[in-house]
C-alpha cells in the first residue's frame, strides 16, 4: 500500500479548526494477525528525507497521538490528553486517516507528517508516510474558512509533468514512427527497382537523372489506418512522496467529488498501551 495526501497545503485563519488527511491507497491486508499503527507528528522543511525529523504536535508526541487497530476496524483517539490539547486523530474503514486541530494559532504553522505501519503478528512489515503543509494566517475574520490545495514547488510539478508527457508522447508516437520508417523503406526499394529497370533499357535510351524522376504513387503500399484524435486527460497522480501531482501543471485542481469528502469516524475505540501518560 501507499499513503497519499489528498491536499499538500492547508491555509487557515487563526482560530479555525482544520482536519489534515492522509489516505491509504492500494490493497490493504485485513488478516486476523495484521494490525495498523498510525500516527501524526511535525517535521521541518529542507530535510534530505521528508518527515525524518520528529517533533511533537502541541507538546504531544507521535506515541500520544497514535492509533493501533485491525485492518477491518475504524479507530479514534478517545483519551483526554489529546482532546485537552485540541487534537483528535481518527481512522475510518475507507483508508482515510486524519488529525483534527482545533482553535489554530500561528504556532501551528509548519510541516505535518502522517505515518502508517503495517504490523504482521509483532513484526513491523511496511512503513509509509505522507507530508503536508499547514499555514495559519493572522488577522483573518473568524468567518473565513480553511483552503486546501495541491500547490507544491512549481519546478518539481513542471519537471514531473514534462517527464510524464514526454513518456506518453514517446510511447504513442512509436507505432507512427515505425510506420513512417516502413513506408520510407518501401518507397526506397520501389525507386531502386525502377532504376534497375531503366538501366536495363538504357542501351536504347539515354540515362535519365533519377533525381528528377517523378514517380507515380505506389499502389501496393498498405494504407495507414486513420486514428481517432488522442485526448489527453489531466488527472491527479500519486507521486513517490505520496503527494498528488497534476499531469498537466496548467490544469486547475478539480473540486473533490462526493467520495473525496472525509468525515472522521468517531466510533470510540479505547487507546492502546502507551509509554507516555494516557
Amino acid at each position: 500500500f501507499k499513503v497519499a495526501t489528498p491536499y499538500s497545503l492547508y491555509v487557515c485563519p487563526e482560530g479555525q479548526n482544520v482536519t489534515l488527511t492522509c489516505r491509504l491507497l492500494g490493497p490493504v491486508d485485513k488478516g486476523h494477525d495484521v494490525t495498523f499503527y498510525k500516527t501524526w507528528y511535525r517535521s521541518s522543511r529542507g530535510e534530505v528525507q521528508t518527515c525524518s525529523e520528529r517533533r511533537p504536535i502541541r507538546n504531544l508526541t507521535f506515541q500520544d497521538l497514535h492509533l493501533h487497530h485491525g485492518g477491518h476496524q475504524a479507530a479514534n483517539t478517545s483519551h483526554d490528553l489529546a482532546q485537552r490539547h485540541g487534537l483528535e486523530s481518527a481512522s475510518d474503514h475507507h483508508g482515510n486517516f486524519s488529525i483534527t486541530m482545533r482553535n489554530l494559532t500561528l504556532l501551528d504553522s509548519g510541516l505535518y507528517c502522517c505515518l502508517v505501519v503495517e504490523i504482521r503478528h509483532h513484526h513491523s512489515e511496511h512503513r509509509v508516510h505522507g507530508a503536508m503543509e499547514l499555514q495559519v494566517q493572522a488577522g483573518k475574520g473568524s468567518g473565513s474558512t480553511c483552503m486546501a490545495s495541491n500547490e507544491q514547488d512549481s519546478d518539481s510539478i513542471t519537471a514531473a509533468a514534462l517527464a510524464t508527457g514526454a513518456c506518453i508522447v514517446g510511447i504513442l508516437c512509436l507505432p507512427l514512427i515505425l510506420l513512417l520508417v516502413y513506408k520510407q523503406r518501401q518507397v526506397a526499394s520501389h525507386r531502386r527497382a525502377q532504376e534497375l529497370v531503366r538501366m536495363d533499357s538504357s542501351n536504347t535510351q539515354g540515362i535519365e537523372n533519377p533525381g528528377f524522376e517523378t514517380t507515380p504513387p505506389f499502389q501496393g503500399m498498405p494504407e495507414a489506418k486513420t486514428r481517432p484524435p488522442l485526448s489527453y486527460v489531466a488527472q491527479r497522480q500519486p507521486s513517490e512522496s505520496g503527494r498528488y501531482l497534476l499531469s498537466d501543471p496548467s490544469t486547475p485542481l478539480s473540486p473533490p467529488g462526493p467520495g473525496d469528502v472525509f468525515f472522521p469516524s468517531l466510533d470510540p475505540v479505547p487507546d492502546s498501551p502507551n509509554s507516555e501518560a494516557i
Epitope: 497514535h66 509483532h122 492502546s272
Partner: antibody
C-alpha cells in the same frame, strides 16, 4: 498508567501444578498480547508463549507445549499461566509482559514484577 | 529457531569509558530490540528497532547494526548503567532473547 501486577511467590512440590496471575490496568486489555517469559537464576530470558485476551488466541514456544497453559479473563483484565508436572527445572522467576506498539514497532513494552516459583521436595 | 549470541558475557568499565556490546543472530533480521535489567528488577524496554531509544533512555546510549550483527554502545558509562542488557527478536516463533551482557562498573 499501564501496570501489570503479578501474583506472589509460590513454593511447590515436584509433580504439582501452579497457576500464576497477571492483572493489567491502564489500557485495553483485550487488544494486546500478553507474553510470558521465564528467567532462571543466573540465566537469561526465555519466551514461553503468549495469549491475546480478546480472542483467546495462543502461541507457544514448542519447548513449553504441555508444560504451560494460558488463559485470560477479560472481565477482570487478568491473564493466567498454569505450569503442570513441576520439576526443579521449573524453578524460576516468571514474568508477564504486555505487547506495546511503539513507533509502529511491537515489543515487550510493559513488564510485571515477576513471580518466583520454587519447586522443592 | 533464531539463536541470538551476545558478547561479551561480562563487560567491566570505568565511569566515562565508551563500551560496546554485540548481538549476533543465526539468521538475518530486519531489526533488533534491546532491554535493560538491573539487579532485582524486571527488564525494561531500552532500544527499539535497532537504533531508537525508548522514552527516558539517556542519549549516551545508541544502537546500530543490520542483518545478523547488532550492537549497543554507551558513549560515556555511568554508575547507573550497571545492568544486564538483552537483545531480542520478534521476527519468528519462538521469539528469542540473547544470553545477555552484564555490564559492571569498576
Amino acid at each position: 498508567q499501564v501496570q501489570l501486577q503479578q501474583s506472589g511467590a509460590e513454593l511447590m512440590k515436584p509433580g504439582a501444578s501452579v497457576k500464576i496471575s497477571c492483572k493489567a490496568t491502564g489500557y485495553t486489555f483485550s487488544r494486546y498480547w500478553i507474553e510470558w517469559v521465564k528467567q532462571r537464576p543466573g540465566h537469561g530470558l526465555e519466551w514461553i508463549g503468549e495469549i491475546l485476551p480478546g480472542s483467546g488466541s495462543t502461541n507457544y514456544n514448542e519447548k513449553f507445549k504441555g508444560k504451560a497453559t494460558f488463559t485470560a479473563d477479560t472481565s477482570s483484565n487478568t491473564a493466567y499461566m498454569q505450569l503442570s508436572s513441576l520439576t526443579s527445572e521449573d524453578s524460576a522467576v516468571y514474568y508477564c509482559a504486555s505487547e506495546e506498539v511503539y513507533d509502529g514497532y511491537p515489543w515487550f513494552g510493559y513488564w510485571g514484577q515477576g513471580t518466583l516459583v520454587t519447586v522443592s521436595a | 529457531q533464531i539463536v541470538l549470541s551476545q558478547s561479551p558475557a561480562i563487560l567491566s568499565a570505568s565511569p566515562g569509558e565508551k563500551v560496546t556490546m554485540t548481538c549476533r543472530a543465526s539468521s538475518s533480521l530486519s531489526y533488533m530490540h534491546w532491554y535493560q535489567q538491573r539487579p532485582g528488577s524486571s527488564p525494561k524496554p531500552w532500544i527499539y528497532a535497532t537504533s531508537n531509544l525508548a522514552s527516558g533512555v539517556p542519549a549516551r546510549f545508541s544502537g546500530s547494526g543490520s542483518g545478523t550483527s547488532y550492537s549497543l554502545t554507551i558513549s560515556r558509562v555511568e554508575a547507573e548503567d550497571a545492568a544486564t542488557y538483552y537483545c531480542q527478536q520478534w521476527s519468528s516463533n519462538p521469539y528469542t532473547f540473547g544470553g545477555g551482557t552484564k555490564l559492571e562498573i569498576k
